[in-house]
């Protein structure tokens, strides 16, 4: 497991192995096997399953081992700690970023990463792309930043800054994560928009005919969505009539802010026999399926 921090800030890391809170945990410098003390007067010391760097230095970077001593088994975890110098500019490099949060709600909250490991007191200060957030739309509450009326303009890198208190001394901690805005999707039972239910279409014998089947499924969440044709309850490809073909692929479109699919049935030259067939437009997705049956009649 990897952890990182910034020079001259507090860094607290937790043993990657988990055990009962009553089990003793010992920490070591992995390369020297030297034990790390528990006395708080040291700059680096152990507190139960946590290793504290107060403050951290670049030279603290390295691999640390923690051993959880339980009655029947010792479990060892390894932690790769990297302490970086503060970036000189506002561009935060990827290696200092915590996981990206994706917002789709109109009102969204961003959590300050790792804050639960620290002895912090409110308020937490928040910055976006290094600028302090002062608009009333941005509200800091506990370890969260609430953003009201989220828009794509709110995308960017958000940094939280708070104070860790230990033995009467305060230490700064900062953490940054990206925020991206996603359109809120919704999925619904398919709706066939064309052809209408029990529709009859006029065709000319000997002439080509095309029938479009269009259905909508919601916005951005059309799982297992498909639109297809059947002839007399048989998939077109298995019907055995070369003159009648379903177009390859599905045309995607939007209608009234919904995602829709269209499949086209082509008849190269309509015959009398075609007038006696049933043509079914089927739309299906995760929620279920629906069919509209149409017939052909001579113009």
């Amino acid at each position: 497991k990897s952890s990182w921090g910034l020079e001259n800030e507090a860094l607290i890391v937790r043993c990657p192995q988990r055990g009962r809170s009553t089990y003793p945990v010992e920490w070591y410098y992995s390369d020297t096997n030297e034990s790390i003390p528990t006395q708080k007067r040291n700059r680096i010391f152990v507190s139960r399953d946590r290793l504290k760097f107060l403050p951290a230095r670049v030279e603290d970077s390295g691999i640390y081992a923690c051993v959880i001593r339980s009655p029947n088994l010792n479990k060892t975890g390894y932690l790769n700690v990297t302490i970086h110098k503060k970036p000189p500019s506002c561009n935060i490099p990827d290696y200092l970023m915590y996981s990206t949060v994706r917002g789709s709600d109109k009102n969204f909250k961003i959590t300050c990463p790792t804050i639960d490991l620290y002895n912090w007191t409110a308020p937490v200060q928040w910055f976006k792309n290094c600028k302090a957030l002062q608009e009333p739309r941005f509200r800091a509450h506990r370890s969260y930043l609430f953003i009201d009326n989220v828009t794509h303009d709110d995308e960017g890198d958000y940094t939280c800054q708070f104070t860790h208190a230990e033995n009467g001394t305060n230490y700064i901690v900062t953490a940054t994560r990206s925020f991206t805005v996603e359109e809120k999707g919704f999925s619904m039972f398919p709706v066939i928009t064309n052809p209408p239910y029990n529709h009859t279409m006029e065709v000319e014998i000997g002439k080509p005919a095309s029938i479009a089947c269009s259905a909508c499924f919601g916005k951005g969440s059309h799982f297992l969505a498909d639109v297809l044709w059947q002839i007399n309850k048989t998939v077109v490809g298995n019907f055995g009539e070369a003159r009648i073909q379903e177009e390859e692929g599905r045309n995607e479109s939007s209608s009234n802010d919904m995602d829709c699919l269209t499949s086209v049935l082509r008849i190269t030259g309509v015959t009398e026999k075609d007038l006696s067939l049933e043509y079914d437009c089927l739309a299906l997705n995760l929620h279920g399926m629906i069919r509209h049956t149409i017939r052909l009649r001579r113009k």
Epitope: F223, L224, D226, L284, L286, G288, M289, I290
Partner: antibody
């Protein structure tokens, strides 16, 4: 309470036909897809196909297309999986499951053994 | 069809340890992924749906994450009853497919 109850274990000879069932209760049977899943001895789960009982529309996995037939009788809230001619390689546990953004309810499974 | 590859095939851990199971899709399935647990002689049981939503009655130690092609099921601290086989399954596009499974066994 939503339940899917499957028919009992079957022992058949190669070449014989078989139809196993899955009865749904506690929900609107015609409004949810019912899928069939095969698990051969000591192996993983394989999706075979699915039916929408409200319309009896079926969709098969390419591996099972033409090998089995899925059907439903909505009047008795029951879905079926059938073989016209069993092979020894059809020996497996077969599960039915309701699909609603995931297979949220499963039948207890029907063990089919095909042996001469 | 979309192929789901689970790793590792077997995970040997002790009770109390953290289990991390991976499921990789051959193409994006967005967040249309579910995780199931199966114990010997039992039907599979739904744990997680839409990549990160816990099913009704599933303990908080089970969590799912990921979207697109890479997904993770995490069991924060293994209980004796968690030793089983775990499957991922996608329902983004037809045909629906399952991963080959990861067996979590007692070390």
């Amino acid at each position: 309470e939503v339940q899917l109850v499957q028919s009992g274990a079957e022992v058949k000879k190669p070449g014989e036909s078989l139809k196993i069932s899955c009865k749904g209760s506690g929900y609107s049977f015609t409004s949810y897809w019912i899928g069939w899943v095969r698990q051969m001895p000591g192996k993983g789960l394989e999706w075979m196909g699915i039916i929408y009982p409200g319309d009896s529309y079926t969709r098969y996995s390419p591996s099972f297309q033409g090998q089995v037939t899925i059907s439903a009788d909505k009047s008795i809230s029951t879905a079926y999986l059938q073989w016209s001619s069993l092979k020894a390689s059809d020996t497996a546990m077969y599960y039915c499951a309701r699909l609603s953004g995931r297979f949220d309810y499963w039948g207890q499974g029907t063990l089919v053994t095909v042996s001469s | 069809e979309i192929v789901l590859t689970q790793s590792p095939a077997t995970l040997s851990l002790s009770p109390g340890e953290r289990a991390t199971l991976s499921c990789r899709a051959s193409q994006s399935v967005r967040d249309a992924l579910a995780w199931y647990q199966q114990k010997p002689g039992q039907a599979p049981r739904l744990l997680i749906y839409f990549a990160s939503n816990r099913a009704t009655g599933i303990p908080a130690r089970f969590s799912g994450s990921g979207s697109g092609t890479d997904f993770t099921l995490t069991i924060s601290s293994l209980e004796p009853e968690d030793f089983a086989v775990y499957y991922c399954q996608q329902f983004n596009t037809w045909p629906i497919t399952f991963g080959q499974g990861t067996k979590v066994e007692i070390k």
